[in-house]
C-alpha cells in the first residue's frame, strides 16, 4: 500500500467499443502521462498491472486473463478483448510499478450495442470533405494492429444501412472510400466492416464515421460584411435607442477562427464609459459557412454618442474587413405652430 502516483480517471479518453468485436486498448500512461515508453519501462524492470471496476460497482478487481480462448489478454502495453462482451463495461486501470516506483491511471471503457444498420450510442468521428473539390478519400479508422500485414481482410462499406455498390460518385477501394466529387447528398454516416481470420476464428471490426461536406477552400473569400453598409443610415434623436447590427458572412475554412467585434471611436466597447451592450448570434449554412451577427445597442443615445465612429470588424484566416456604420443625429422638424405664427406676422 505504498504511495502511487494516481492520475485519476481519465475521462478525456472515453473509450467506446462494439459488443462482440475485438478491441485493443493501449495503456494511456505511456501515451499521455509518462515521458517514457513501455519498452523503456519494461527494460528498467517495471511491471504493468491491469485491473478494473465493473459498471455500478466500487470494488477494484483483477482482470481474469484465464478465460476460455484467451478472450482477454495483455500484450506489452495493450489490453486485448477477443471479443468484447457487454458486461466488460467499466473503469479500467493500468498500473506501472516496481518496489520503488508506482504510477497508475484509470479510464472508462464502454461496450456498445449496435443494430443491423450500425445505429448505436457510439460517438462518431466527423470527416469533412470539400464540396466539388475533386477526388477525396476517407480511410477506415482505428484498424491498425488488429491483424498482421500478411492477413488480407475483406472490407465492406455501407452508407447508412446500404452496402455501397454502383454508387454514382462513391467508390470502395479496400480500406479507402473514394468520393469522386463530393456533394451535399454525400452527407451521412459511412461504415466499414473489416473481416479477418485469426486462429481459426473470424472477427469483424465495425467503424462508423460521419461525412460532412463543407465549403471548398477554392471558394473561400475574406469575411463579407452585410451590415453595416452604405445603404442604411442610423438617424436618431437623443434619448432614442441606437441598434446597429454587424452581420458578417464567413466562408468555411478548416481550422479558421472567425472573429467579429465592434469598436467605438477606435476602442473596444469594454474600454469606454458609455452604456453599450452587444449580443451575438451565429448561424451556419449546409456547407458550414458561418454568419455571425453582433448587435450593438445603446439604450438612450446622447448627441455625443451620435458623433462617434461605430466600426464593425471581422477577421478570418482569409483576411480582415471593417465597415463604419453611418450614424447621424436626426434634425428635429420645425415646430409648425411657431412657423405659422411667424408666417402671419405675429409678434
Amino acid at each position: 500500500s505504498e504511495r502511487c502516483d494516481d492520475w485519476g480517471l481519465d475521462t478525456m479518453r472515453q473509450i467506446q467499443v462494439f459488443e462482440d468485436e475485438p478491441a485493443r486498448i493501449k495503456c494511456p500512461l505511456f501515451e499521455h502521462f509518462l515521458k517514457f515508453n513501455y519498452s523503456t519501462a519494461h527494460s528498467a524492470g517495471l511491471t504493468l498491472i491491469w485491473y478494473w471496476t465493473r459498471q455500478d460497482r466500487d470494488l477494484e478487481e483483477p482482470i481474469n486473463f484465464r478465460l476460455p480462448e484467451n478472450r482477454i489478454s495483455k500484450e506489452k502495453d495493450v489490453l486485448w478483448f477477443r471479443p468484447t462482451l457487454l458486461n466488460d463495461t467499466g473503469n479500467y486501470t493500468c498500473m506501472l510499478r516496481n518496489t520503488t516506483y508506482c504510477s497508475k491511471v484509470a479510464f472508462p471503457l464502454e461496450v456498445v450495442q449496435k443494430d443491423s444498420c450500425f445505429n448505436s450510442p457510439m460517438k462518431l468521428p466527423v470527416h469533412k470533405l470539400y464540396i466539388e473539390y475533386g477526388i477525396q478519400r476517407i480511410t477506415c479508422p482505428n484498424v491498425d494492429g488488429y491483424f498482421p500485414s500478411s492477413v488480407k481482410p475483406t472490407i465492406t462499406w455501407y452508407m447508412g444501412c446500404y452496402k455501397i455498390q454502383n454508387f454514382n460518385n462513391v467508390i470502395p477501394e479496400g480500406m479507402n472510400l473514394s468520393f469522386l466529387i463530393a456533394l451535399i447528398s454525400n452527407n451521412g454516416n459511412y461504415t466499414c466492416v473489416v473481416t479477418y481470420p485469426e486462429n481459426g476464428r473470424t472477427f469483424h471490426l465495425t467503424r462508423t464515421l460521419t461525412v460532412k461536406v463543407v465549403g471548398s477552400p477554392k471558394n473561400a473569400v475574406p469575411p463579407v460584411i452585410h451590415s453595416p453598409n452604405d445603404h442604411v443610415v442610423y438617424e436618431k434623436e437623443p434619448g432614442e435607442e441606437l441598434l446597429i447590427p454587424c452581420t458578417v458572412y464567413f466562408s468555411f475554412l478548416m481550422d479558421s477562427r472567425n472573429e467579429v467585434w465592434w469598436t467605438i471611436d477606435g476602442k473596444k466597447p469594454d474600454d469606454i464609459t458609455i452604456d453599450v451592450t452587444i449580443n451575438e448570434s451565429i448561424s451556419h449554412s449546409r456547407t458550414e459557412d458561418e454568419t455571425r451577427t453582433q448587435i450593438l445597442s445603446i439604450k438612450k443615445v446622447t448627441s455625443e454618442d451620435l458623433k462617434r465612429s461605430y466600426v464593425c470588424h471581422a477577421r478570418s484566416a482569409k483576411g480582415e474587413v471593417a465597415k463604419a456604420a453611418k450614424v447621424k443625429q436626426k434634425v428635429p422638424a420645425p415646430r409648425y405652430t411657431v412657423e405659422l405664427a411667424c408666417g402671419f406676422g405675429a409678434t
Epitope: 475574406p222 469575411p223 463579407v224 465612429s309 482569409k318 483576411g319
Partner: antibody, heavy 117, light 112 residues
C-alpha cells in the same frame, strides 16, 4: 512589401504601364490602390482594385487609367494616353482591409513618370 | 464628387505645443476618414482610420475627431519628428461614388 516599376520619360499620348510587385501579400485578401503625387504637390487618388478584382476609379481618372491584377503578385496601372499633367510619382498602396476603402496602410516607394515632348 | 478641403495649408508650433488640423468634406462621409503623415522623399504613413482609430505604433499624442463633414487631427506634445505634411482622406474607395478616396490638399506642420 510593395515595389513599383515602369516609370520613365514618355512623350504625350504614349501608353505606359506601371507594375506593382508584391511580396508576402496575398492579393486575394487585400484591396490594392494607386495614388500619385506631382512634384511639390499633394496626394491624388487614382483608383483601387478589390480583392476579388472589381475596380473603382476617381471620376477624373476614368478612361485615362486602367487598374488590373496581372498575376498573383502583380497589379498594373495602365496610363492610356498620358499628358504632361500626368507627370508625377506614382505610388502603389495596399488597403488595410480586404473590403475596399482606400485606407492605405502599406505603400511602395513610388516610381517617377515624366511626360514631356 | 466628394471634395476634401484641409485648413490651414501650413501651421507652425513649438516643441511641446499642440497643433490642430481641420478637414471638411463636401458632403457627409460619416466616419469614413483617414489621416496620413508624409515626410519629404518618403511615401505617406497611415496614422488614423475611421476618424479615431489609431494605427498600431502611432503615439496617442495623435487624436482624430469629428463626424459627418467636419473633422480634426490634433497633435499634442509636439516633437521635432512630427514635422511633416498631413493629409486627410475620405475612405469611400469601394462605394462606387466618384473620387471615393479623395485626399485633402495637405497641411504642412513646422515644429520650431
Amino acid at each position: 512589401s510593395l515595389e513599383e516599376s515602369g516609370g520613365r520619360l514618355v512623350t504625350p499620348g504614349t501608353p505606359l504601364t506601371l507594375t506593382c510587385t508584391v511580396s508576402g501579400i496575398d492579393l486575394s485578401s487585400y484591396a490594392m490602390g494607386w495614388v500619385r503625387q506631382a512634384p511639390g504637390k499633394g496626394l491624388e487618388y487614382i483608383g483601387i482594385i478589390s480583392n476579388s478584382g472589381t475596380t473603382y476609379y476617381a471620376s477624373w481618372a476614368k478612361g485615362r487609367f486602367t487598374i488590373s491584377k496581372t498575376s498573383s503578385t502583380t497589379v498594373d496601372l495602365k496610363m492610356t494616353s498620358p499628358t504632361t499633367e500626368d507627370t508625377a510619382t506614382y505610388f502603389c498602396a495596399r488597403d488595410r482591409y480586404a473590403n475596399t476603402h482606400g485606407i492605405f496602410s502599406l505603400w511602395g516607394q513610388g516610381t517617377l513618370v515624366t511626360v514631356s515632348s | 464628387d466628394i471634395v476634401m478641403t484641409q485648413t490651414p495649408a501650413s501651421v507652425s508650433a513649438p516643441v511641446g505645443g499642440t497643433v490642430t488640423i481641420n478637414c471638411q468634406a463636401s458632403e457627409s462621409i460619416y466616419s469614413d476618414l483617414a489621416w496620413y503623415q508624409q515626410k519629404p522623399g518618403q511615401p505617406p504613413k497611415l496614422l488614423i482610420s475611421f476618424v479615431a482609430t489609431l494605427e498600431s505604433g502611432v503615439p496617442s499624442r495623435f487624436k482624430g475627431s469629428g463626424s459627418g463633414t467636419e473633422f480634426t487631427l490634433t497633435i499634442s506634445d509636439l516633437e521635432s519628428a512630427d514635422a511633416a505634411t498631413y493629409y486627410c482622406q475620405c475612405t469611400y474607395g469601394g462605394s462606387g461614388s466618384g473620387n471615393g478616396a479623395a485626399f485633402g490638399g495637405g497641411t504642412e506642420v513646422v515644429v520650431k
